[in-house]
C-alpha cells in the first residue's frame, strides 16, 4: 500500500478501503491550453486508411460519450482513389481510463475502469506467412 | 448543483464543493477481458506513416507513465522503402483523462485532467492551398 507522505495539507481518509478509494475533483483541468492546429478533425477522411466515427454512449460512464474509429476498408486507398488490398487498414487502439458509476445511478461515486478504444486507422504492410 | 438521486445505496457527500468532488475506487476494473489479437504492438514499424514511442513520466499523475507517438517522417513510406513527400505523416491525437495529485504529493486526493496524447500516425493527402 501507499504510505501517506508527511504533508499535513493532504485530506485525510478514514475509509476502511483507503487508499483504494480517493477523492477526485471532477472540475476538469484542461492542459491543452491552446488549440492545437495539428489536431485536425478531417484526418479520418484524408487518410489512406480512412475511418468512420461511431458514437458509443453509456450514461453510467464518465466520459459518457466516446467516438470510436472503424476503418472503412480492409485495404488502403491509393492516389487514384482505388483500394490497394496488398496493404491493410488497421485500427490504432489505446487503453484509456474512464470512471464508472458505482453503485449505478450514483452521481458522486465512481470506480476507475480501463477500456480499449480505437482512435483512428493507419495503413500497414501485411505480415505474409510463407507456407513451407 | 446536483441533488443525490433517490438511490439510498449512494454514498453521501457533505463536501461544500459537491458534486465536483466525488469518491473514486482506484481498484481498476479492466473491461478488456481477452487479449485482442489485432492489437499488435508492431504497427508503429509496419505503418506507411511509422512512429517512435516516447516515454512521458510524471509521478504526480495517474497513470504516471504515458507512451506518446512521434511520426518518424514528414512524408509517408512507399512500397520501395523511400519516403513520399507528396503525402504527410500526421499524429492521431486523443484527449484522455488522467488523475493529477492535488495538493501535490497527496496519495488520496486528485483532480481530473484532460491531456492530449498522440497515439499513432496515419498517412494523409495534404491540403493544397492554391495561390490566386
Amino acid at each position: 500500500g501507499i504510505a501517506i507522505p508527511r504533508n499535513s495539507g493532504c485530506p485525510n481518509s478514514e475509509d476502511k478501503n483507503f487508499p483504494r478509494t480517493v477523492m477526485v475533483n471532477l472540475n476538469i483541468h484542461n492542459r491543452n491550453t491552446s488549440t492545437n492546429p495539428k489536431r485536425s478533425s478531417d484526418y479520418y477522411n484524408r487518410s489512406t486508411s480512412p475511418w468512420n466515427l461511431h458514437r458509443n454512449e453509456d450514461p453510467e460512464r464518465y466520459p459518457s460519450v466516446i467516438w470510436e474509429a472503424k476503418c472503412r476498408h480492409l485495404g488502403c486507398v491509393k492516389a487514384d482513389g482505388n483500394v490497394d488490398y496488398h496493404m491493410n487498414s488497421v485500427p490504432i487502439q489505446q487503453e484509456i481510463l474512464v470512471l464508472r458509476r458505482e453503485p449505478r445511478h450514483c452521481p458522486n461515486s465512481f470506480r476507475l475502469e480501463k477500456i480499449l478504444v480505437s482512435v483512428g486507422c493507419t495503413c500497414v504492410t501485411p505480415i505474409v506467412h510463407h507456407v513451407a | 448543483g446536483i441533488a443525490i438521486p433517490r438511490n439510498s445505496g449512494c454514498p453521501n457527500s457533505e463536501d461544500k464543493n459537491f458534486p465536483r468532488t466525488v469518491m473514486v475506487n482506484l481498484n481498476i476494473h479492466n473491461r478488456n477481458t481477452s487479449t485482442n489479437p489485432k492489437r499488435s504492438s508492431d504497427y508503429y514499424n509496419r505503418s506507411t506513416s511509422p512512429w517512435n514511442l516516447h516515454r512521458n513520466e510524471d509521478p504526480e499523475r495517474y497513470p504516471s507513465v504515458i507512451w506518446e507517438a512521434k511520426c518518424r517522417h514528414l512524408g509517408c513510406v512507399k512500397a520501395d522503402g523511400n519516403v513520399d513527400y507528396h503525402m504527410n505523416s500526421v499524429p492521431i491525437q486523443q484527449e484522455i483523462l488522467v488523475l493529477r495529485r492535488e495538493p501535490r504529493h497527496c496519495p488520496n486526493s486528485f483532480r481530473l485532467e484532460k491531456i492530449l496524447v498522440s497515439v499513432g500516425c496515419t498517412c494523409v493527402t495534404p491540403i493544397v492551398h492554391h495561390v490566386a
Epitope: P59, V65, W67 | -
Partner: antibody
C-alpha cells in the same frame, strides 16, 4: 453565460436545401456535442441527429440519414444542419441543443431559440 | 426504436392541484430520462434531468421519479405559469426519442 443563437427563418421551395446555423458561446465548444431536434406545427419533438465538433463525428436518426448533414466549424464555434430534398413535411421549427458528452447525466441543458423553416411552392 | 408513451395526452387542472404525468418506454430498460416544459413559440426548457434531478432555477414543486420503463413527473401544487406542454425524453438508447407530449390546460 451559455448561449446558442440560431440563424433566422427560411422559406424554401420543395426539392431545395436549407442550412441552419447555431452559434455557441459561453462554454468550451469541444466539450459538448450539438444535437438537432425539430418540431412540426402542432406536433411533438423529433430528434434529427448529433455532431461532435471535437472529432467531426456525426450520428443520424435513420429517418434523416442521407438528407441531413451535420457539421461544425470549431474556429467560429458554430454548428450547422443542412437538410436537402426538402418537402412540405419538413416545415418545422429546428432547434440545436448542446449535450454534455462527459456526463450524460446533464443531458440537453441549453437550447437555441429555434429556426422556422417553411417549405412551400 | 424505443417509443416513449406519455399519458395523459392532455389534462385540465386548477391552480393548487397536484398533477402527475407518466411516461412509459416500449421496450428495454432506460438509463435516465429528462422532462421538458414548452410554452407556445418557445424552445423547450429542461425541468428534470437524470430522472430525479431538478434543473437549475426550476421550482421544487417539480419532481421526477421512476426506473426501468416507467417514469413520472409530478407537480405538487400547480401555479399559473405551469400551464404548458410537457415532454419526456430518453437518452442512451439510439435514437433519442421524445414522448408525444402532455398538454396541461387550466380547468
Amino acid at each position: 453565460e451559455v448561449q446558442l443563437v440560431q440563424s433566422g427563418a427560411e422559406v424554401k421551395k420543395p426539392g431545395s436545401s436549407v442550412k441552419v446555423s447555431c452559434k455557441a458561446s459561453g462554454y468550451t465548444f469541444d466539450d459538448y456535442e450539438i444535437h438537432w431536434v425539430r418540431q412540426a406545427p402542432g406536433q411533438g419533438l423529433e430528434w434529427i441527429g448529433v455532431n461532435d465538433p471535437e472529432s467531426g463525428g456525426t450520428f443520424y436518426n435513420q429517418k434523416f440519414d442521407g438528407r441531413a448533414t451535420l457539421t461544425a466549424d470549431k474556429s467560429t464555434s458554430t454548428a450547422y444542419m443542412e437538410l436537402s430534398s426538402l418537402r412540405s413535411e419538413d416545415t418545422a421549427v429546428y432547434y440545436c441543443t448542446r449535450y454534455d458528452k462527459w456526463d450524460s447525466f446533464y443531458g440537453m441543458d441549453y437550447w437555441g431559440q429555434g429556426t422556422t423553416v417553411t417549405v412551400s411552392s | 426504436d424505443i417509443q416513449m408513451t406519455q399519458s395523459p395526452s392532455s389534462l385540465s387542472a386548477s391552480v393548487g392541484d397536484r398533477v402527475t404525468i407518466t411516461c412509459s418506454a416500449s421496450s428495454g430498460s432506460i438509463s435516465y430520462i429528462d422532462w421538458f416544459q414548452q410554452k407556445p413559440g418557445k424552445a423547450p426548457k429542461r425541468l428534470i434531468y437524470a430522472t430525479f434531478e431538478l434543473a437549475s432555477g426550476v421550482p421544487s414543486r417539480f419532481s421526477g421519479s421512476g426506473s426501468g420503463t416507467d417514469f413520472t413527473l409530478t407537480i405538487s401544487s400547480l401555479q399559473p405559469e405551469d400551464f404548458a406542454t410537457y415532454y419526456c425524453h430518453q437518452l442512451g438508447s439510439y435514437p433519442d426519442t421524445f414522448g408525444q407530449g402532455t398538454k396541461l390546460e387550466i380547468k
